[in-house]
């Protein structure tokens, strides 16, 4: 068309929120969709001045399509003024946003209400228990198995005796980490389960109960004394 | 006996810099999270700084967010609080305090073991 | 951040007869585990503060059973059952459910 105009915004419900406040860490989008002809050229400043790539670590990205600016793994230093300038020939028009980066506070681990659940089985079965770790800070876990030893669950100390049955390693996901498979269960394997899951503010943990049915059309079979565990 | 030792206090000029160490033992240092804690003479008690047990995670008060950094040393049992910029209001007693360690606990998990902490005077 | 409430400023206490200590937080120290995450301390003059109670209400190894402590979500009381002389000095009440940990302004237990 050779109807000239001066840039106007197309969509100016996507630029009604004009204060965001983002985690660190987050990304952040801001949008000014715009039309005009010829189509207008987009720029941006950060508080007044020209935004440029090197005033942030890693940069930012603008989609020219899209009429965006994409901040990624947003800090404190990012916080401010972000206006876009929409212009051609026949005219500018901007907007302004605020983006203001909250830094959460970094919590204990939180373990979802609930997780591990309690289990049953029949000997020979399998099983598995979950947990669902949220943490701010890097969580280290570990599922733990209370044993006996001697016949006693607890030591001299009167602390309960443990064995650490999986724990985040290098090679371990937080994926793998969060599932404990117990495969062709016998009745030593009845007992308490924790998953525990640390932090360098503090450690959570939640237990739960494995019970061991004899098999169907089977006696309950007699089984030895177990190994005790070192 | 699990034992916090801290050094490196002293008087010191706003503006200059200072390390604080703090060598722990018998415990495994390696372990557990450590924490710095304050306390103005005469007034209460301060939070500072956390680093978590393998140094990947640190965190700080508002205070000092900036000016203090915290690290640590597994091979020699060692904590630090590398205290640029300092100014008047950080002058304080700062205690080494041991944070939560990585595994089950059936007592508190930290916060249990102070060192006597060492003084720092920041004066003109 | 945590705000900690401690009440109140002072204490003078007959040896023998009981003494009470509250500290309230702005936020629920109530955690997803079950457990509330109030510490209490006492540090004497010239000493580093020592470890009461943790998790609202257990006592720390060592502790006489003459101290307890008490509470539900953002309301803690510590107790001296009979005070002794050895009791003397300054008792905190610290959050430690999330950074920055955050300490109650102390309150001073004297004999009188």
């Known amino acids: 068309s050779n109807n000239k105009r001066a840039p106007y915004w197309t969509n100016t419900e996507k630029m009604e929120k004009r204060l965001h406040a983002v985690p660190a860490a987050n990304t952040v989008k801001f949008r000014c969709p715009a039309g005009g002809n010829p189509m207008p050229t987009m720029r941006w400043l950060k508080n007044g001045k020209e935004f440029k790539q090197e005033h942030r670590i890693g940069g930012y990205k603008v989609r020219n399509q899209h009429w965006s600016l994409i901040m990624e793994s947003v800090v404190p230093s990012d916080k401010g003024n972000y206006t876009c300038v929409v212009e051609n020939e026949y005219g500018s028009i901007n907007h302004t946003y605020h983006l203001d980066v909250v830094e959460r506070s970094p919590h204990r681990p939180i373990l979802q209400a609930g997780l591990p659940a309690n289990a049953s089985t029949v000997v020979g079965g399998d099983v598995e228990f979950v947990c669902k770790v949220y943490s701010d800070a890097q969580p280290h876990i570990q599922w733990i198995k209370h044993v006996e030893k001697n016949g006693s669950k607890y030591g001299p100390d009167g602390l309960p005796y443990l064995k650490v049955l999986k724990a985040a390693g290098v090679n371990t996901t937080d994926k793998e980490i969060e599932v404990l498979y117990i495969r062709n269960v016998t009745f030593e394997d009845a007992g308490e389960y924790t998953c525990l899951a640390g932090n360098s503010i503090g450690i959570s943990f939640h237990s739960a109960w494995l019970t061991v049915l004899p098999a169907p059309g089977r006696e309950k079979e007699i089984t030895a004394s177990p190994d005790y565990l070192e | 006996e699990v034992q916090l030792l801290e050094s490196g206090g002293g008087v010191v000029q706003p503006g200059r810099s200072l390390r604080l160490s703090c060598a722990a033992s018998?415990?495994?240092?390696?372990?557990?999270?450590m924490h710095w804690v304050r306390q103005a003479p005469g007034k209460g008690l301060e939070w500072v700084a956390v680093i978590s047990y393998d140094g990947s995670n640190k965190y700080y008060a508002d205070s000092v967010k900036g000016r203090f950094t915290i690290s640590r040393d597994n091979s020699k049992n060692t904590l630090s609080l590398q205290m640029n910029s300092l100014r008047v209001e950080d002058t304080a007693i700062y205690y080494c305090?041991?944070?939560?360690?990585?595994?089950?606990?059936?007592?508190?998990?930290?916060?249990?073991?102070w060192g006597q902490g060492t003084m720092v005077t920041v004066s003109s | 951040d945590i705000v900690m409430t401690q009440t109140p400023l002072s204490l003078s206490v007959t040896p023998g007869q009981p003494a009470s200590i509250s500290c309230t937080s702005s936020r629920s120290l109530l955690h997803s585990d079950g457990k509330t995450y109030v510490y209490w301390y006492l540090q004497k003059p010239g000493q580093p503060p020592q470890l009461l109670i943790y998790e609202l209400s257990n006592r720390f190894s060592g502790v006489p059973d003459r101290f307890s402590g008490s509470g539900s979500r953002t309301d803690f009381t510590l107790k001296i059952s009979r005070v002794e002389a050895e009791d003397v000095g300054v008792y905190y009440c610290?959050?430690?459910?999330?950074?920055?940990?955050?300490f109650g302004g102390g309150t001073k237990v004297e004999i009188k």
């Open positions: 305090v041991r944070g939560a360690g990585r595994g089950y606990t059936y007592g508190p998990d930290g916060f249990d073991i």
């Open positions: 018998g415990f495994t240092f390696s372990s557990y999270a």
């Open positions: 610290m959050q430690y459910i999330e950074a920055p940990l955050t």
